[in-house]
């Protein structure tokens, strides 16, 4: 009888011997539970599972409190994994995150945190980085320490308002806070002066919409 | 979409005044607050005056109190900046900014400049001795 081999991450695609990008099944250590999640196997070495993409607009991310825990989107494309997978994973061993960012110019940035990790849907996800390193700001754009994920129909923010109707996605909002890579997308020469566009306050400032952005993470061993 | 358009900068001498207006289009003030700042060659921008009319609160700057005074007319949809008894260290370029009204941590009064997410191109303010 053949061995069923399963896969919690990138990483251990890759290390298996599956270098190629592409979207991979991945499965939780005593978990039935499938997910679909591209796999970048070049940048940085490889191994990174993407838990967010966002690039053309054609993914509504303005999204209920369960389709970000379970996740949405085209992994191909535009897509947010899924809190609780994300949640799980994190919790199981040191993980880093890598946020990368296009403009509407031409330039690319990233931010990278050494330590990574979502905290249980009781406790609402809670987002908790440390070591912040990278070319999209000194400061990080993700409000510190660590705020709630907040939805359209669960505000956990710390905002008289309620940051995810009034700014659009789900997000770790403050009130509201210096980023929200879940916002509305907008084109090109429309990207700006947005009180709801995707930002990254840190890199590009206040008002700029993004033309794209990527979230992923690889176990801090790697 | 929205627009902010600053105007009424220019030379002026020591202990002079000038009126800055910044008007706005794509959204009425009712719903936002306006903020000016400035910016001064190689320094950092910084807070000057904020107004919100959904209750009439004004904010000022500690080095601008007394001097400056903030007002809006809903009709043009235009916030002005007063400025008197100016001085050399008030040169900068001068910007205002809109927020949301609403967008306010609980407990708090103002906002921080990452939450202004409209800002117009601003004006130069040259004060000579």
């Known amino acids: 009888k053949e061995e069923q081999i399963s896969f919690r991450d990138c990483a251990e695609v890759f290390k298996s011997g599956h270098t190629t990008n592409g979207v991979y099944t991945l499965t939780l250590p005593n978990s039935t539970e499938e997910v679909k999640a591209y796999c970048d196997m070049e940048a940085g070495g490889g191994g990174w599972t993407i838990i967010q993409r966002r690039e053309d607009g054609s993914v509504d991310f303005q999204r209920t409190w369960k389709e970000y825990k379970v996740g949405f989107g085209n992994p191909s494309g535009e897509y947010w994994l899924g809190n609780e997978f994300v949640s799980q994973l994190t919790n199981q061993q040191r993980y880093v995150l890598k946020i990368h960012l296009k403009d509407w110019e031409g330039n690319e940035a990233y931010s990278l945190y050494e330590h990574f990790y979502l905290s249980s849907e009781e406790l609402n996800y809670r987002i908790h980085l440390k070591g912040l390193t990278g070319t999209a700001g000194k400061i990080s754009s993700i409000s510190q320490p660590g705020n709630d994920f907040s939805t359209k129909d669960a505000d956990n923010d710390k905002c008289i308002c309620k940051c995810s109707q009034m700014l659009t996605g789900g997000w770790w909002f403050d009130a509201c806070g210096p980023s929200n890579l879940n916002g509305m997308y907008y084109p090109q020469r429309q990207n700006t002066n947005k009180f709801n566009g995707i930002k990254w306050y840190y890199w590009k400032g206040s008002g700029y919409s993004l033309k794209g952005t990527t979230m992923m993470i690889r176990p801090a061993d790697f | 979409e929205v627009q902010l358009v600053e105007s009424g900068g220019g030379l002026v001498q020591a202990g002079g005044s000038l009126r800055l207006s910044c008007a706005a289009s794509?959204?009425?003030?009712?719903?936002?607050?306006i903020g000016w700042f400035r910016q001064a060659p190689g320094k950092e921008r910084e807070g000057v005056s904020t107004?919100?009319?959904?209750?009439?609160?004004?904010y000022y700057a500690d080095s601008v109190k007394g001097r400056f005074t903030i007002s809006s007319d809903n009709d043009k949809n235009t916030v002005y900046l007063q400025m008197n008894s100016l001085k050399p260290e008030d040169t900068a370029v001068y910007y205002c900014?809109?927020?949301?009204?609403?967008?306010?941590?609980?407990?708090?009064?103002?906002?921080?400049?990452?939450?202004?997410?409209?800002w117009g191109q601003g004006t130069l303010v040259t004060v000579s001795s």
């Open positions: 900014a809109a927020v949301p009204a609403g967008r306010l941590r609980f407990g708090e009064q103002w906002y921080p400049l990452y939450e202004y997410d409209a």
């Open positions: 794509g959204f009425t003030l009712d719903d936002y607050a």
């Open positions: 107004i919100r009319d959904s209750d009439g609160s004004t």
